[in-house]
């Protein structure tokens, strides 16, 4: 398994379970050390890190790019590196970290979640089933490019978004990643944290569609942080 | 050709174990999910167990929690499930199963049927 | 766990008949329904996924439909191979659970 290499994905600081915006709890999990899993209110971290080796943004974490971890080092050895934050420099998109994107090589902030290639996201769904393990991160599924000679379908197995036909996205179905609706207005959503507070992406949602902006419901904005509904609403 | 093939089926007695075996080909088996599937003689289908394409992620029926471990030697192109502390309810053939193009089982295995009886 | 209750538990028909499959779910499920058909001594095969996508190589006769907790798969013109038991799966989430199975005999 990925367990020995699994560290650079380790989370700290992970505010409580969000399963309460989707109407479910969060589900008790066990995991492997290096890795943070909720489980009921108490939360596991492990504090070493570890590099993982990439060939692309993609195998990373939410939090990560796929980059040399030297200037101008060996193009073939590569590693997930910390994302960058906002006004920090930048040469794409997956090198800002949620919320951010890379706008004349400057990570800015960003209120629509478009600009990332994958959906960054929590635990916003419930497990389900309080008895499931989990024996690492789940990694991206690498697929062959050639496998896609016509856009996914909904339900289809997707390595990115551009896989997938016009109005889905690619992102995280439990074991899979598969093709999943852009968010229409009024539906919920998922808004990005702070660095450091995304959650083990099993199950996720896309990004809200164009024109639209993930934002706190208006009738919920006098619940606690932890419960406040998102939807993806009109500009 | 997409193909999946089962091994390691018998008859076992209650308390005992087994390693059931899936070898795959024609397919890049390292990219996939993978499953154990179920049938009990007469009976309808029902879900084991799945495992990430990387082996890193596992889920299990709460019916064969804590007994049966998933696995897979992706430089082997195959899957295995270790079933341990067998009961008799766990009589059945046994599938593999991939999700190889999307969320439905679309390639599987011809089955090993497992008894379980003393 | 998630329930899945599909009816009738069998029916009969005859060649060319339409016939309809349904499938109810214990608490929405979205669209993460698939179908399967599965023969005497053979391993089940995928029809439809994500309740209304059609399986590469399926007939266009299967088709799927529903959203939520109910769902239907229908055979336009039943054909001598349709005979079989169909099964409806949910893959929303673990564990996953199938129907009881809808087993279409000869008339």
């Known amino acids: 398994t990925l367990n020995s290499v699994l560290n650079s994905n380790a989370i700290k600081n992970l505010p409580p379970p969000l399963g309460g915006a989707a109407g479910h709890p969060g589900s008790a999990v066990s995991a492997a050390p290096g890795i943070l899993y909720p489980g009921g209110n108490k939360y596991q971290t492990i504090d070493n890190y570890q590099p993982y080796p990439c060939a692309e943004d993609e195998e990373c974490g939410t939090d990560e790019y796929c980059a040399s971890p030297t200037r101008g080092g060996d193009a073939g050895v590569q590693i997930c590196l910390a994302c960058r934050k906002r006004r920090k420099r930048c040469m794409r998109h997956a090198m800002c970290c949620p919320g951010n994107y890379c706008k004349n090589g400057i990570c800015v902030s960003s209120d629509q979640n478009h600009f990332r290639g994958e959906i960054e996201e929590t635990i916003t769904e419930s497990f389900g089933n309080d008895h499931s393990t989990l024996d690492g991160y789940s990694r991206r599924t690498t697929l062959s490019s050639k496998m896609y000679h016509t856009k996914g379908q909904e339900g289809s197995v997707c390595l990115r978004s551009s896989d997938c036909a016009s109005g889905l996205c690619c992102a995280r179905h439990f074991w899979s990643k598969i093709c999943k609706p852009v968010l229409k207005e009024g539906q919920v959503c998922t808004k990005h944290r702070r660095k450091g507070s995304h959650g083990l992406e099993i199950f996720q949602r896309c990004y809200c569609g164009e024109g639209l902006s993930c934002r706190i419901q208006k009738d919920h904005h006098q619940a606690s942080n932890s419960s406040r509904l998102h939807t993806c609403q009109r500009h | 050709e997409v193909q999946l093939l089962e091994s390691g089926g018998g008859l076992v007695q209650p308390g005992g174990s087994l390693r059931l075996s899936c070898a795959a080909s024609?397919?890049?088996?390292?990219?996939?999910?993978m499953a154990w599937v179920r049938q009990a003689p007469g009976k309808g289908l029902e879900w084991v167990s799945t495992?990430?394409?990387?082996?890193?992620?596992?889920y299990y029926a709460d019916s064969v929690k804590g007994r049966f471990t998933i696995s897979r030697d992706n430089s082997k192109n195959t899957l295995y499930l270790q079933m341990n502390s067998l009961r008799a309810e766990d009589t059945a053939v046994y599938y593999c199963a991939g999700h190889r193009s999307n969320i439905g089982w679309d390639v599987w295995g011809q089955g090993t049927l497992v008894t379980v009886s003393s | 766990d998630i329930q899945m209750t599909q009816s009738p538990s069998s029916l009969s028909a005859s060649v060319g008949d339409r016939v309809t499959i349904t499938c109810r779910a214990s608490?929405?499920?979205?669209?993460?329904l698939n179908w399967y058909q599965q023969k005497p001594g053979k391993a089940p095969k995928l029809l439809i996924y994500?309740?209304?996508s059609l399986q590469t190589g399926v007939p266009s006769r299967f088709s799927g439909s529903g959203s939520g907790t109910d769902f239907t798969l229908t055979i336009s013109s039943l054909q001598p191979e349709d005979f079989a038991t169909y099964y409806c799966q949910q893959s929303y989430r673990p564990p996953l659970t199938f129907g009881g199975g809808t087993k279409v005999e000869i008339k």
């Open positions: 024609g397919f890049s088996f390292s990219s996939f999910a």
């Open positions: 994500a309740t209304s």
């Open positions: 608490q929405t499920i979205r669209t993460y």
């Open positions: 495992i990430s394409g990387s082996g890193d992620v596992t």
